[in-house]
Interface confidence: low
């Protein structure tokens, strides 16, 4: 009954509105409904238009699919055509009053199937279902895997592929570990995979600017170094430096009324030269203060070097030696002065004798037949030397003596003429000036070294050669070279070094051997007034400790490279320093700053004195050592 | 001799990203020893560190930045580059890339310099 | 506010020495020898003229030289020249291993 209703509305609509032209109330007839006539009267107005002798050519390209007024105006009420559904998208598509529906292919939606159903994100189905990758297609879609793995037979999970076991050569020599999805070609810490030679090579880490300062590259690791010598340290990070830093405040207050007689290891203090009226005799005043036992105080000469006067210190005592034309002596005499006091110290050439006074009280005497210098053309010229000799007058000495003399001088008047403009010259020069307060021991400012030649081999010991160290010491920065056994070849075949622990305020002592830390003993309050006894023997068989908090042995299994490269070492030639290391590379030893601090050294049965070294910077103060720092000083 | 030429937009947006590229020529940028490095200098003068790169992929960068740089490498054009996010009008100074020896914290070739404003 | 302070401007008449002065603290500059000094001719490329504090790279005029002490650097440059005019930035490694420069020093040649 509908298809002939329909076929009934065709027939009217031909007649009245194909063959004769319709209005709206004409064709609402036809229709006999409003939505439908509402939707067809503006289309066939269009319709009309278009087939008006082409005139509304705009208008006109809505019609193009039509070929004549008859089947563009029988089209307008089929909703189904032109087709409104998406093509890709709809099965079928049903004709309705002004409306149309259509219906979808699986996996499209929408009022015109024109919308893909995005199965990858149906929440009732995550992921479509896929273990990896969902692709959505249009209408469909499909799983896939990532690279590395592949598809099972239900097309929805994925299985990892092992590299390693389908290419065993695939990283040359390197290792290969499977990973999921993927392989990794690994190499030792310390190297990096190169893909052309499938092999592992050595990473060169310095050129990375791993260290702060200095970097020593070796296969598979790389080390840093800091420059001791300059004061620095390795920070705990193993990579940057740090400053190191005084852990026991010293006194080094200065007076430039103080004469230090100790500012060159070898050399004269200060050179005097006096033009007084011949009837001038030879004096000598002032204060002294050491706690070395032998130097020279003072060498007085005649212009010609013909006649001299030398004051000195022998075992703690005051000594003098003279020559001139009519005689030479040697007298020592008086009570032992290198006691740390100041002692006055006073020598006057009399008419006939010259006398050495000790606190105002006459000590010595010595007979004399004419005066000590002659003077000449109405004059006496005299030079006057303090703390060393002018030249080489060893030969000329009466009885030899080791120069170096580590002590102070003060309000002194030499020639009955005052300071005379000395106190000036002194005041300008720094290091010519003594410190206010010392103690007894040798200084190590941390700025320089003492070398001594000691063989320690013992032809009567069955061991062949040891090294017996006893080292009092009291440190004033927590990291330094105290002890160090050098070799021709530049290698540190032995070293015993102080290092800032990782523990607040204490220091750990290590003991090296080249640049391999062979024992390290931990956590000793060192930086203290008090001053710590530590003692080291060693053979080519055993380590022997002894520490304040420690006494231990470790023997030969332990140690069985180190103590063979230590043995190689002491066969050949070393030499001793102390206080640090002479120039050898940052790499030699664990350790490379300079010892700061108070130390004496013992080495088998021998006390060091540093006057007698080799060589010693200057600023080492051999038998002297600032007090500890006291907040309420008096300076 | 070594040369190097810093090339990008002279005028960024704030909010943006300035982009700048190093172009490295009578040397290549994968050889041992060298870092590429980035400084700025502000109108008012003063030179400021951006960060360095290794050929190898190692970055180095100020750390008041770090949240918003990101250096580069591409070995095979022989370049190196620069992204700097969100940029104020702070950032508006001239661009430097220069050549930083492994050696120390020296940077012994620098290029002419490309001045980039940030202004909307 | 640059990590390094420098004079704003010095300047010297032809012939004369001058000293740039660099003060740091003991992070940077007094902690350590990585020490550099760069001239910069407005619109050129900057030039590095001292290295480690005191040394010269190949190809630099030995009338400029370079010292530190404690937290100061400097940078003297002797028998002045008008074609040392230009500005002087000095840079120093840091703890925290980054790179730092100073203000920038602007020598006027008399």
């Known amino acids: 009954a509908n298809s002939m209703l329909e076929e009934t509305k065709q027939g009217n609509l031909e007649r009245e509105c194909i063959e004769e032209l319709c209005n709206k109330e004409e064709a609402r007839e036809v229709f006999e409904n409003d939505p439908e006539t509402d939707y067809f009267y503006p289309k066939y107005l269009v319709c009309l238009r278009s087939f008006q002798s082409g005139l509304f050519t705009a208008a006109r390209q809505s019609t193009d699919a039509y070929p004549d007024l008859r089947s563009c105006v029988n089209a307008i009420p089929d909703q189904c055509s032109p087709l409104p559904c998406n093509e890709d998208g709809y099965m079928s598509c049903k004709d309705g009053k002004a409306s149309f529906t259509c219906t979808c292919k699986p996996g499209w939606q929408g009022e015109k199937c024109e919308f893909d159903i995005n199965e990858c994100k149906d929440p009732s189905n995550i992921n479509g279902g896929c273990s990896q990758i969902c692709d959505n297609t249009p209408g469909s879609y499909h799983c896939s895997c990532k690279s590395g793995f592949v598809m099972l037979s239900n097309k929805k999970d994925c299985k990892d592929v092992d590299e390693c076991s389908l290419k065993p050569n695939m990283c040359g020599t390197a290792v290969c570990k499977n990973i999921p999805g993927d392989f990794e070609c690994e190499c030792p810490e310390g190297y990096r995979y190169n893909l052309k030679s499938k092999s592992c090579e050595d990473v060169d880490e310095c050129s990375e600017n791993m260290c702060a300062q200095l970097c020593v590259n070796y296969p598979g690791g790389y080390t840093c170094y800091c420059d001791g010598k300059k004061g620095f340290k390795l920070a705990q990070d193993q990579k940057s430096c740090e400053a190191v830093s005084v852990c026991l405040p010293l006194n080094l207050d200065t007076k430039y009324e103080l004469l230090y007689l100790a500012e060159q290891f070898a050399g004269v203090v200060l050179y005097l030269k006096f033009r007084l009226p011949e009837i001038s005799r030879f004096s000598a005043e002032f204060d002294f203060r050491t706690y070395d036992s032998q130097g020279v105080i003072l060498y007085a000469e005649s212009i010609d070097h013909s006649a001299w006067l030398l004051i000195a210190l022998r075992g703690g005592k005051i000594e003098v030696q003279l020559k001139n034309e009519h005689t030479s002596k040697i007298t020592t005499g008086g009570d032992i002065i290198n006691n740390g006091l100041w002692n006055m110290v006073s020598v006057e050439e009399l008419e006939h004798s010259i006398s050495i006074k000790i606190a105002k009280e006459a000590v010595m005497d010595i007979n004399k037949p004419g005066p000590l210098f002659k003077p000449e053309n109405g004059l006496l010229e005299t030079k006057v030397y303090f703390a060393g000799f002018p030249r080489k007058v060893e030969s000329e000495l009466i009885k030899p003596i080791n120069p170096r003399l580590d002590g102070c001088i003060r309000s002194w008047n030499l020639m009955k003429q005052g300071a005379s403009g000395i106190k000036e010259i002194i005041q300008e020069k720094q290091n010519k000036h003594c410190l206010v307060t010392v103690e007894k021991g040798s200084y190590y400012p941390g700025s320089g070294i003492a070398e001594f030649h000691i063989d320690y081999n013992n032809g009567s010991n069955a061991e062949g050669w040891h090294i017996n160290v006893t080292l009092n010491i009291r440190p004033s920065m927590g990291t330094g070279v105290m002890l160090a056994l050098v070799s021709s070849n530049n290698t540190v075949p032995f070293a015993v070094s102080l290092v800032d622990s990782t523990s607040e305020k204490s220091q750990d002592i290590v003991i090296s051997v080249e640049n391999t830390v062979i024992y390290r003993i931990q956590a000793l309050s060192l930086c203290s007034n008090q001053r710590s006894h530590l003692e080291f023997r060693v053979n080519r068989n055993n380590l022997e400790l002894l520490t304040p908090l420690k006494i231990e042995t470790i023997s030969q299994e332990e140690l069985q490279t180190q103590l063979a490269i230590l043995d190689k070492a002491m066969k050949g030639k070393v030499a001793t320093y102390l206080g640090g290391l002479p120039d050898v590379p940052f790499s030699a030893t664990p350790v490379n700053a300079f010892y700061n601090g108070c130390m004496e050294v013992n080495i088998n049965g021998v006390e060091l004195d540093l006057d007698e070294a080799i060589s010693k910077h200057n600023d080492i103060r051999a038998h002297s050592c600032p007090s500890v720092w006291k907040k309420t000083k008096n300076s | 001799q070594v040369q190097l030429q810093e090339s990008g937009p002279g005028l960024v947006k704030p909010s943006q990203t300035l982009s700048l590229t190093c172009t490295v020529s009578g040397g290549s940028i994968t050889s041992d020893g060298y870092h590429w490095s980035w400084i700025r200098q502000y109108p008012g003068k003063g030179l400021d560190w951006i960060g360095y790169i290794y050929y190898t992929g190692n970055t180095y960068y100020n750390p008041s930045l770090k949240s918003r740089v990101t250096i580069s490498v591409g070995t095979s054009q022989n370049q190196f580059s620069l992204k700097l996010i969100s940029v104020t009008a702070a950032d508006t100074a001239v661009y430097y890339c220069a050549r930083r020896l492994s050696t120390g914290p020296y940077f012994d070739y620098w290029g002419q310099g490309t001045l980039v404003t940030v202004s909307s | 506010q640059s990590a390094l302070t420098q004079p704003a401007s010095v300047s010297g008449s032809p012939g004369q020495s001058i000293t740039i002065s660099c003060t740091g603290t003991?992070?940077?500059?007094?902690?350590?020898?990585?020490v550099s000094w760069y001239q910069h001719h407005p619109g050129k490329a900057p030039k590095l003229m001292i290295y480690d504090v005191s040394s010269r790279p190949s190809g630099v005029s030995n009338r400029f030289s370079g010292s530190k002490s404690g937290n100061t650097a400097s940078l003297t440059i002797s028998g002045l020249q008008a074609e040392d005019e230009a500005d002087y930035y000095c840079s120093s490694y840091t703890r925290s291993s980054t790179v730092v420069f100073g203000g920038g020093a602007r020598l006027t040649v008399l």
């Open positions: 003991s992070s940077d500059v007094g902690g350590y020898e990585f």
